[in-house]
Interface confidence: low
């Protein structure tokens, strides 16, 4: 059977005003872009470009947007059900074991290895040992001991929550 | 399984208006969000509207309040759009989107319909 929502647990005036930001929660859950009042009796919109909700909740409080740091681009901006997608300015990466901030890659490979990944928004250069192909995982290099090449293209976004 | 079937884009003038249709077959439950989202080329899909439980409540992309209104029909199982004083930039192709939620908290599925194409032009 095809049906739409046929819920009556909201106020005349509530279902009459077009623009409304207020509802009743449907058992004790709020949509996303909003969060629960403290009553539990309202659904309240979070603010756009302020704080948001994905998923369907009974928060009191709806979670702020990430804010970019220095270092870092917007991809998209922050709705009211979608957090901000940050991601490393080109040249620097993120990595998961220290995401709190970008790095900035290396500029080349040390001697007698060779690069076989770019430098991205979230990984190093990749280099590897020319005879074993063994990956190099070690310290920046001195510079005339250095393959030099170019950053990477950022290829696809990196999310962060915050 | 839900199905969203959009209709009413086209081609219009600058300043024009056009209301988008979207039918949803299959089985919607009483706790969902029905919305629509655009995507110009090259761009990602964003949030233009969404009415939840019942019609409710409403939630607008900041561009478009004002100039869009989003609104439901639960008799005809429709979801519609009304988009007035149309600009170039509004081209794109609009999705219906419909995020039902399940028992456990946080867990919804989202269904899209395959869009409807809006071409503005000055």
């Known amino acids: 059977e095809s049906a739409l929502i046929t819920q009556q647990d909201l106020a005349p005036q509530q279902r009459a005003a077009p623009q409304q930001k207020r509802s009743s929660p449907s058992e004790g859950l709020c949509p996303p872009g909003h969060h629960i009042s403290e009553d539990g009796r309202d659904c309240i919109s979070c603010k756009y470009g302020q704080d948001y909700s994905t998923h369907w909740n009974d928060l009191l409080f709806c979670l702020r947007c990430t804010r970019c740091d220095s270092g870092e681009v917007e991809l998209s901006p922050c709705t009211t059900t979608r957090n901000t997608v940050c991601q490393c300015e080109e040249g620097t990466f993120r990595e998961e074991d220290s995401p709190e901030m970008c790095r900035k890659c290396r500029t080349g490979c040390p001697r007698g290895m060779v690069k076989v990944g770019d430098c991205t928004p979230w990984s190093d250069i990749e280099c590897v040992h020319k005879e074993s192909g063994t990956k190099h995982s070690g310290e920046v290099p001195a510079v005339e001991e250095t393959v030099t090449s170019s950053p990477g293209t950022p290829a696809s976004p990196c999310s962060l929550s915050g | 399984q839900v199905q969203l079937q959009e209709s009413g884009g086209g081609l219009v003038q600058a300043g024009g208006s056009l209301r988008l249709s979207c039918v949803a077959s299959?089985?919607?439950?009483?706790?969902?969000?029905m919305g629509w989202y655009r995507q110009a080329p090259g761009k990602q899909r964003d949030l233009v509207a969404q009415?939840?439980?019942?019609?409710?409540?409403?939630n607008y992309a900041p561009s478009m309040e004002g100039r869009f209104a989003i609104s439901r029909d639960n008799a005809k199982s429709t979801v519609y759009l009304q988009m007035n004083n149309l600009k170039p930039e509004d081209t794109a192709v609009y999705y219906c989107n419909a995020e039902v939620k399940s028992a456990d908290w946080g867990a919804y599925a989202n269904y899209w319909g395959q869009g409807t194409q809006v071409t503005v032009s000055s």
């Open positions: 009415i939840t439980m019942g019609g409710g409540i409403t």
């Open positions: 299959g089985s919607i439950f009483t706790n969902n969000a």
